[in-house]
Interface confidence: medium
């Protein structure tokens, strides 16, 4: 697993709070759950629930914990060594092409297709043609074409305030 960071992930702090634990770097690196001091002499612990680091590192700041969006549920909280794990809430999914937002799962398949896969937090329902068994492209059908299994609206993105 790579420590993927973006500029917004860093949790800057000019100096360590007095209560933060310190230890010495090993070959210039600090253990997971810590970052290095500006002078490179100390390892300073990340703040539980606020920031984290997952690898041996020489980061000047720990990485800022992710906050789950309103359309997500928190599977596990942020610790000093692991970021928050968020998942789309029931009835929505996160697709690879737009991972920044949870989209509503379709409520049914287009005419002439049958459902072979349920809505999960990481995938929409899966539809195949009755005869050929080939998968549907995944595009959202027009409302009038949809054979619904329960009342609902076609897929639409959840708004992310991130």
């Amino acid at each position: 697993e790579s420590a993927l960071i973006t500029q917004q992930d860093l949790a800057p702090q000019q100096r360590a709070a007095p209560q933060q634990k310190r230890s010495s770097p090993s070959e210039g690196l600090c253990p997971p759950g810590h970052h290095i001091s500006e002078d490179g002499r100390d390892c300073i612990s990340c703040k539980y629930g606020q920031d984290y680091s997952t690898h041996w590192n020489d980061l000047l700041f720990c990485l800022r914990c992710t906050r789950c969006d309103s359309g997500e549920v928190e599977l596990s909280p942020c610790t000093t060594t692991r970021n928050t794990v968020c998942q789309c809430e029931e009835g929505t999914f996160r697709e690879e092409d737009s991972p920044e937002m949870c989209r509503k799962c379709r409520t049914g398949c287009p005419r002439g297709m049958v459902k072979v896969g349920d809505c999960t937090p990481w995938s929409d329902i899966e539809c195949v043609h009755k005869e050929s068994g080939t998968k549907h492209s995944g595009e959202v059908p027009a409302v009038e074409e949809t054979v619904t299994s329960s009342p609902g609206t076609p897929a639409s993105p959840c708004s992310l305030s991130g």
């Epitope: 800057p12 000019q14 070959e27 210039g28 690196l29 020489d58 700041f61």
Partner: antibody, heavy 119, light 110 residues
């Protein structure tokens, strides 16, 4: 988005001074150190010095000691690099970069400022 | 002033794996971690690895790094034409109290 915007190209005569600016935006300027680097034509990158934008502390390379000054204006979220007693060997591209690791992980760079020293 | 030593050039064919070495001393690589940069002609360097082997966001996992003693190396697997660039290693030098760079390795994709 996070960016560092540097001032434009300069042409100077030997013995003169040059002052280049580097404006940071899209992040908490005071929380990072900004480093200055030079790349002479066809040469390796050379570290010049850095400033802690929060407290103003500076550190300079021995190669530039005495003729390099790095300052910052926190209200303008801008760092400045002034090099004096210019000589032809100082011709090159000067970069500012933001550092987020102790060992020189520079994640955001300015586009560079070309300084030409010629009589 | 001591600096880091890199081979001036390296090459490989698309899909191949290439390795670029970076040799230093006890006061830089021996004591601190290494960063690697990719520089395309006429552009600023771009960080591709930090803390010896960590990739910033957006850098493909084809790029990996390692460090042993006073040497470090950058490996690029599944080589692509867009990887053709100049690669620099860098580290902090405690004796000089400053940053040091390698001379750069020009990678050619044949």
């Amino acid at each position: 988005q996070v960016q560092l915007v540097q001032s434009g190209a300069e042409v100077k005569k030997p013995g003169a001074s040059v002052k280049i600016s580097c404006e940071g935006s899209g992040y908490t300027f005071n929380s990072y150190t900004l480093h200055w680097l030079r790349q002479a034509p066809g040469q390796r990158l050379e570290w010049m010095g850095r400033i802690n934008a929060g407290n103003g502390n500076t550190k300079y390379s021995q190669n530039f000691q005495g003729r390099l000054s790095i300052t910052r204006d926190t209200s303008a979220t801008t760092a400045y690099m002034e090099l004096s007693s210019l000589r032809s060997e100082d011709t090159g591209v000067y970069y500012c970069a933001r550092v987020f690791t102790y060992s020189f992980g520079m994640d955001v760079w300015g586009r560079g400022t070309l300084v030409t020293v010629s009589s | 002033q001591s600096v880091l030593t890199q081979p001036p050039s390296a090459s490989g064919t698309p899909g191949q794996r290439v390795t670029i070495s970076c040799s230093g001393g006890g006061s830089n690589i021996g004591r601190n971690s290494v960063s690697w940069y990719q520089q395309l002609p006429g552009t600023a360097p771009k960080l591709i690895l930090y803390s010896n082997n960590q990739r910033p966001s957006g850098v493909p996992d084809r790029f990996s790094g390692s460090k042993s003693g006073t040497s470090a190396s950058l490996a690029i697997s599944g080589l692509r034409s867009e990887d053709e660039a100049l690669y620099y290693c860098a580290a902090w030098d405690d004796s000089l109290s400053g940053g040091v760079f390698g001379g750069g390795t020009k990678l050619t994709v044949l």
